[in-house]
Amino acid sequence: LTCLGGFASPGPVPPSTALRELIEELVNITQNQKAPLCNGSMVWSINLTAGMYCAALESLINVSGCSAIEKTQRMLSGFCPHKVSAGQFSSLHVRDTKIEVAQFVKDLLLHLKKLFREGQFN
């Protein structure tokens, strides 16, 4: 999962390839982490179930000025059909737990690796 291999092809990529690329980006972030990721910024935790890509984007988009996760933010927008912007929370419920971006990325990475291996969600 950590090796891209080959050149990026023009046009659409298969969904499994897009997911693999997202996983690879999250791996890069966790491996290259020297100082606290995004200066230890806190984000809302999410449930890793249906709607998690949009929820993850909504959570991470509120972290500004952190170049380390900009690519992840861009990539996640391709997994979510809805327009998500900073400061906008679609949740009607008050999210009750905040965690560090580093932990958020780690949790998301572990879950996506599991999904990629199993090749299923529902």
Epitope: A18, A50, S90, S91
Partner: antibody, heavy 123, light 112 residues
Framework: EVQLVQSGAEVKKPGASVKVSCKAS????????VSWVRQAPGQGLEWIGE????????YYNEKFRGKATMTTDTSTSTAYMELRSLRSDDTAVYYC????????????????WGQGTTVTVSS | DVVMTQSPLSLPVTLGQPASISCRSS???????????LHWYQQRPGQSPRLLIY???NRFSGVPDRFSGSGSGTDFTLKISRVEAEDVGVYYC?????????FGGGTKVEIK
């Protein structure tokens, strides 16, 4: 067997509100979204919005923002949609449907539908 | 919003004969990940819509193999190889590549 059972028909006066329910069974409620679609008399289908019970995130068709509010109760596997400031042109059959996504994105399709709830707005 | 245009509006068919419904979208429905989120629903008289085909050509569980979907980009087709009496109703195409998700106006299939 997947089932979505909706509440019964409603007759309301203009300006009133109505809350339609959709009880899900036969699957894990939080691993799918729930969408709402309306069908006015003799008309086609119109997507209102979707809600993800597992994350509580809601997304609306801009046309229905401020008109519809979607909620869920995970303890009873029930989705709700409230319509406010009802007008005669809100008269329609309202359907809930299960929004099936895949493991690799939140894109998907409506795979199972409720029987529909008729809302009539008349003075 | 993406406009979905179906033709014909009405389709009188003879039992046992094939039928074909066309659906055209105002924008390409190909997502950057490669999937095309174009689906077909059947609504029998007095009933709720029912999923027939998802992502262009995948038959949903329990759907008879006389139903098939094809197409790409902006042009899609639903085919019924041999129409049966239970196939009477309105057929809708729908896209979920772009928000808001939209439906075609429907094609009414009736027996001649």
């Amino acid at each position: 067997e997947v089932q979505l059972v909706q509440s019964g028909a409603e007759v309301k006066k203009p300006g009133a509100s109505v809350k339609v329910s959709c009880k899900a069974s036969g699957y894990t409620f939080t691993t799918y979204g729930v969408s709402w679609v309306r069908q006015a008399p003799g008309q086609g289908l119109e997507w209102i919005g979707e809600i993800y019970p597992g994350n509580y995130n809601t997304y609306y068709n801009e046309k229905f923002r401020g008109k519809a509010t979607m909620t869920t109760d995970t303890s009873t596997s029930t989705a709700y949609m409230e319509l406010r400031s009802l007008r005669s042109d809100d008269t329609a059959v309202y359907y809930c449907s299960r929004w099936r996504t895949s493991y690799f994105s939140d894109y998907g399709y409506f795979d199972y539908w409720g029987q529909g709830t008729t809302v009539t707005v008349s003075s | 919003d993406v406009v979905m245009t179906q033709s014909p509006l009405s389709l009188p068919v003879t039992l046992g004969q094939p039928a074909s419904i066309s659906c055209r979208s105002s924008q390409s429905l190909v997502h950057s990940h490669g999937n095309t989120y174009l689906h077909w629903y059947q609504q029998r008289p007095g009933q709720s819509p029912r999923l027939l085909i998802y992502t262009v050509s995948n038959r949903f569980s329990g759907v008879p193999d006389r139903f098939s979907g094809s197409g790409s980009g902006t042009d899609f087709t639903l085919k019924i190889s041999r129409v049966e009496a239970e196939d009477v109703g309105v057929y809708y195409c729908s896209q979920s590549t772009h928000v808001p998700y939209t439906f075609g106006g429907g094609t009414k299939v009736e027996i001649k």
